[in-house]
Amino acid sequence: QFPRQCATVEALRSGMCCPDLSPVSGPGTDRCGSSSGRGRCEAVTADSRPHSPQYPHDGRDDREVWPLRFFNRTCHCNGNFSGHNCGTCRPGWRGAACDQRVLIVRRNLLDLSKEEKNHFVRALDMAKRTTHPLFVIATRRSEEILGPDGNTPQFENISIYNYFVWTHYYSVKKTFLGVGQESFGEVDFSHEGPAFLTWHRYHLLRLEKDMQEMLQEPSFSLPYWNFATGKNVCDICTDDLMGSRSNFDSTLISPNSVFSQWRVVCDSLEDYDTLGTLCNSTEDGPIRRNPAGNVARPMVQRLPEPQDVAQCLEVGLFDTPPFYSNSTNSFRNTVEGYSDPTGKYDPAVRSLHNLAHLFLNGTGGQTHLSPNDPIFVLLHTFTDAVFDEWLRRYNADISTFPLENAPIGHNRQYNMVPFWPPVTNTEMFVTAPDNLGYTYEIQWPSREFSVPE
C-alpha cells in the first residue's frame, strides 16, 4: 500500500508521497534522494485508456486510475535507483550506485538441503511475525481515509507476510457501492485478464525483497513447487516443509508444523462488502487445507500433468480477445487455468494454476484468502517460472498484451493495484534473468513426456 511516511494528514491532503532519503538540512530537503541525484518528485503517470465495459462503475472505486485517488505525486528514480524514496536499487542491481549486477536462483523446494528447507520455513515464519518496516495498510476507503474527525489517518501496521496477503485481497475485493447496496463482484485487478502473470510476478518480487531485507541476506530466494506431477498427493505437505495433514482434523495442518500456528487475515468478507470497510491486520482462524480432498469435484483431486506445462508453452500468443477468463489460444488464460492446456477455452475446465489452488481444497482455494496458505508462494513461483520460459521462447512478445479495453486494471500500462511505488504491467513483462535479477533452476518437460512403466 503506502509508505509509513506518507500515511499522514499532510501527505494525503497534498497528494504528494515523496519521502526524504537523507534529509541533512531538515524535512523535505532530500525528497527522493534528489540531493544525490537519485531521483525527483514528479507527477504520477496513470493509465487513462478505456477498460472493457464489464466494469460499469467508473468513479466508485479507489483502484481506478491507481493510485490517483490517494496520491498524484511520487518519486521518479533515475537509472537503476528505485524504491519509495529512491533509496534502493532496481531488481537485479546492488551497490551504493546501483551499478553492480546480481542474480539470485529460485530452486525447487524439494531439491533444497535439509538446512536450506529449514531456513526457508523459519524465514516465512519470521515474515509472518515481523512488522513491515516500510508499508502500512489502509483500513478505510479514500473518502474515509482521514477518519471521522478528518484528522486521523486510517492506516495500520501489518506483518511482512500479512502485507503480502493484504495486497492480494485488495486487488480482488468487490467494489463497494454504498451501504444497503450489493457490492459489485465482477471486478478483479489481478486475475482473469492479461495482468494475471505480471501482477503475481511483482507480488512475489516484493515479498522476496522484503524477506531479503528482513534476513539481511541478498541471496535469499523464494523456491518453487513443481505442482505438475499428475499426482493426487501434495509432495511438499510434510512437516519439514509446508506441513502435513493433522491427525485430529483432516482439514487442518499438523501441529508438528509451524504453519499450524498461523492465523489468517482478510476473512471477514461480510463486513467489508456490507460496511465498506477494508481488511485490517486482525488475524482470525487457522489455515484450512485438505489436499485432494474435494470428493464433490473429482476433477480437482489430481494435480496437473507434466505434459500440461509442455503443452501450454506451445501457445504462442500471450493473450487474445476478450482478454478475460474465456479467452481461447491465450497463453495467459491457459497457464492461469481457465483453458485446457492446449489453449482451448472450456467453461468446465480448471487446469494448471487454478487446478493447483483448487486441489489444496481450503484456504488456498479461495481467491480472497489464498495467500494465507504459504503454499501460495511456491505455487506462484512455479507459475512465474512457466511465464518466464514463455517470455524466453517468444522473445517477450508484448504485442498481444492490450493497451486498452482489457478488464479494468489489466491494460498494459496500468499501475498494478495496490503496489507502491507505482509499477506497470509492462515493467514485469521482461525476462527475469536479464532484467529482474533472478533465474529458475528448472528442467522443462518435452511434449513427448511419458511416465515410465
Epitope: R94, A96, Q100, R101, M214, L215, P218
Partner: antibody
Framework: EVQLQQSGAELVRPGALVKLSCKTS????????LHWVRQRPDQGLEWIGW????????VYDPKFQGTASLTADTSSNTVYLQLSGLTSEDTAVYFC??????????????WGQGASVIVSS | CIQMSQSPASLSASVGETVTITCRAS??????LAWYQQKQGKSPHLLVY???TLADGVPSRFSGSGSGTQYSLKISSLQTEDSGNYYC?????????FGSGTKLEIK
C-alpha cells in the same frame, strides 16, 4: 562517538551458561543489526549470528543454533549473548559488532573490545 | 553455505613492499565482501567493504578488488603497523562466514 562496550571476562564451569552484554552508545541500536563473532585461542573468526533490536528477530549460524541466544534491551541500548551447555570448545573471546545496512553495505563497521570466556572445571 | 578460502595462511614482507591476500568464495558473492585487520589482542578493524570501498580513515595504500568468486586485498608501501591478521567475510548468504585468516609479518 560510536562505542560498543562489552562485559568483563567470565570463568564458568562445563555445562553451565553465561550471558555476555554489549552496551552501545553513539547510535540508536534500533537502526542497526547487531552481530556476534567468536574467536577461539589462536584461531580465526567465527560468525555466530545477528539480532535486529528493533523487533527481536534473530538468525544464527546452524552450528550455534540451540546453544547461542541473542536478546536486546532497546531501553538501555544493550544486546546480550547467552551461551548454554558450555564445553571447553567454547573457550574464546566473543565480540559484538554492528552492521550498517544502508545500501546493503557489506561490513561490520564497529566492534566491541571482546569478552573472554573460559570454560574450565 | 558459502565457504571462504583465504590464502596465504601467512606471509612475511619488508617495509615498502607490496603484498596481496586473496579470498576465494565457493560461489558468486557479488562483491558482498569485507576485509578486516586484527592486531594481537585487539578487536578486528574494518578496512574495506563492498569488496572495493575503503572504510573511513583507512590509508589509501590498502585497496580491495575482485568480483564473482575471486577477491583480493592489496597493501602497497608496507608499514610496520600493518602487521597482524587479515580476514575476509562475505555477506551474500547466511551464514556470513569468514576466511581462515592471513598472518602478515613485517620483516
Amino acid at each position: 562517538e560510536v562505542q560498543l562496550q562489552q562485559s568483563g571476562a567470565e570463568l564458568v564451569r562445563p555445562g553451565a551458561l553465561v550471558k555476555l552484554s554489549c552496551k552501545t552508545s553513539g547510535f540508536n541500536i534500533k537502526d542497526y543489526f547487531l552481530h556476534w563473532v567468536r574467536q577461539r585461542p589462536d584461531q580465526g573468526l567465527e560468525w555466530i549470528g545477528w539480532i535486529n533490536p528493533d523487533n527481536g528477530n534473530t538468525v544464527y549460524d546452524p552450528k550455534f543454533q540451540g546453544t547461542a541466544s541473542l536478546t536486546a534491551d532497546t531501553s538501555s541500548n544493550t544486546v546480550y549473548l547467552q551461551l548454554s551447555g558450555l564445553t571447553s570448545e567454547d573457550t574464546a573471546v566473543y565480540f559484538c559488532t554492528r552492521r550498517d545496512y544502508t545500501y546493503e553495505k557489506a561490513a561490520l563497521d564497529y566492534w566491541g573490545q571482546g569478552a573472554s570466556v573460559i570454560v574450565s572445571s | 553455505c558459502i565457504q571462504m578460502s583465504q590464502s596465504p595462511a601467512s606471509l612475511s614482507a619488508s617495509v615498502g613492499e607490496t603484498v596481496t591476500i586473496t579470498c576465494r568464495a565457493s560461489g558468486n558473492i557479488y562483491n558482498y565482501l569485507a576485509w578486516y585487520q586484527q592486531k594481537q589482542g585487539k578487536s578486528p578493524h574494518l578496512l574495506v567493504y563492498d569488496a572495493k570501498t575503503l572504510a573511513d580513515g583507512v590509508p589509501s595504500r590498502f585497496s580491495g578488488s575482485g568480483s564473482g568468486t575471486q577477491y583480493s586485498l592489496k597493501i602497497s608501501s608496507l608499514q610496520t603497523e600493518d602487521s597482524g591478521n587479515y580476514y575476509c567475510q562475505h555477506f551474500w548468504s547466511l551464514p556470513f562466514t569468514f576466511g581462515s585468516g592471513t598472518k602478515l609479518e613485517i620483516k
